[in-house]
């Protein structure tokens, strides 16, 4: 006998009960491919989820994060609270970050500044909670025999970096 | 690649006043920082001052707190080091920097540290 069921297009169930017709699926259902036997429930986006797109026949509901959260894991399946920049969540809440670290953004952990010494440089200007060091010149770039001028062009022009 | 060009640098008495400017063109989008070094014949070059293009954050070095004041227009792309109560051992040739990474960013083929050919600031006592 041939599974008629394979014919059912998204948006419809193969209704066992019905001899194998395809029925639309109910309200607050979907079914994004075809050939399903049921149809899934919608995923509703309440407490800390707010509806970033409605639910429809063929595919499933998708939810943001309210205001002061943001989303975590596959599909938004967590929120998480916002902190300020310069802060980390711990189980208590937001703590600042400790002397040293910085965090640039308002989700993560605090991160240690950039050691520019490890790295063969001077510190341009220091870092603060909200933001990392930059590091400048080399200090064989500052000696008194260093060339001032600017080196040559470079293979390609530097990424944007945020101002 | 970002070209600077600094000017107002001269010849003045111990006490008196000084703007430096440093014009910046070019990728200048991609500038976090720029900095005042400044060297003394036979000595290194020192961090005079810097800032933060974005927030206007700024460093200053212990001997010249309180005398010079670093600013910037970032509408002209334009960084300014204005001197008061120069000393004679304010005496360079001053330098303008521009760095285009936070960290000690590197990638191959990319320029971070840019500098201005200098302007000489002398301060007769």
């Known amino acids: 006998l041939q599974d008629l069921c394979s014919n059912c297009p998204a948006g419809t169930f193969c209704d066992n009960n019905r001899s194998q017709i395809c029925s639309p699926c109910p309200p607050n259902s979907f079914s994004s491919a075809g050939g399903q036997r049921t149809c899934d429930i919608c995923r509703q986006c309440k407490g800390v989820f707010k509806t970033r797109k409605e639910c429809s026949s063929t595919s499933n509901a998708e939810c943001d994060c309210i205001s002061g959260y943001h989303c975590l894991g596959a599909e938004c399946s967590m929120c998480e609270q916002d902190c300020k920049q310069g802060q980390e969540l711990t189980k208590k809440g937001c703590k600042d970050c400790c002397f040293g670290t910085f965090n640039d953004q308002k989700r993560g952990i605090c991160r240690p500044w950039t050691n520019c010494s490890l790295d063969g440089k001077s510190v341009l200007v220091n870092g603060t909670k909200e933001r990392d060091v930059v590091c400048g010149p080399s200090p064989a770039d500052l000696s008194p025999g260093a060339s001032s001028a600017t080196p040559p062009a470079p293979a390609r022009e530097p990424g944007h970096s945020p101002q | 690649q970002v070209q600077l060009q600094e000017s107002g640098g001269g010849l003045v008495q111990a006490g008196d006043s000084l703007r430096l400017s440093c014009a910046a063109s070019?990728?200048?989008?991609?500038?976090?920082?720029m900095g005042w070094y400044r060297q003394a014949p036979g000595k290194q070059r020192e961090l005079v001052a810097s800032?933060?293009?974005?927030?206007?954050?700024?460093n200053y070095a212990d001997s010249v707190k309180g005398r010079f004041t670093i600013s910037r227009d970032n509408a002209k792309n334009t960084m300014y080091l204005q001197m008061n109560s120069l000393k004679p051992e304010d005496t360079a040739v001053y330098y303008c920097?521009?760095?285009?990474?936070?960290?000690?960013?590197?990638?191959?083929?990319?320029?971070?540290?840019?500098w201005g050919q200098g302007t000489q600031v002398t301060v007769s006592s």
């Open positions: 070019g990728s200048t989008f991609s500038i976090v920082a």
């Open positions: 920097y521009a760095r285009t990474g936070y960290g000690s960013s590197w990638l191959m083929g990319h320029e971070y540290d840019y």
């Open positions: 800032i933060i293009t974005g927030d206007g954050d700024t």
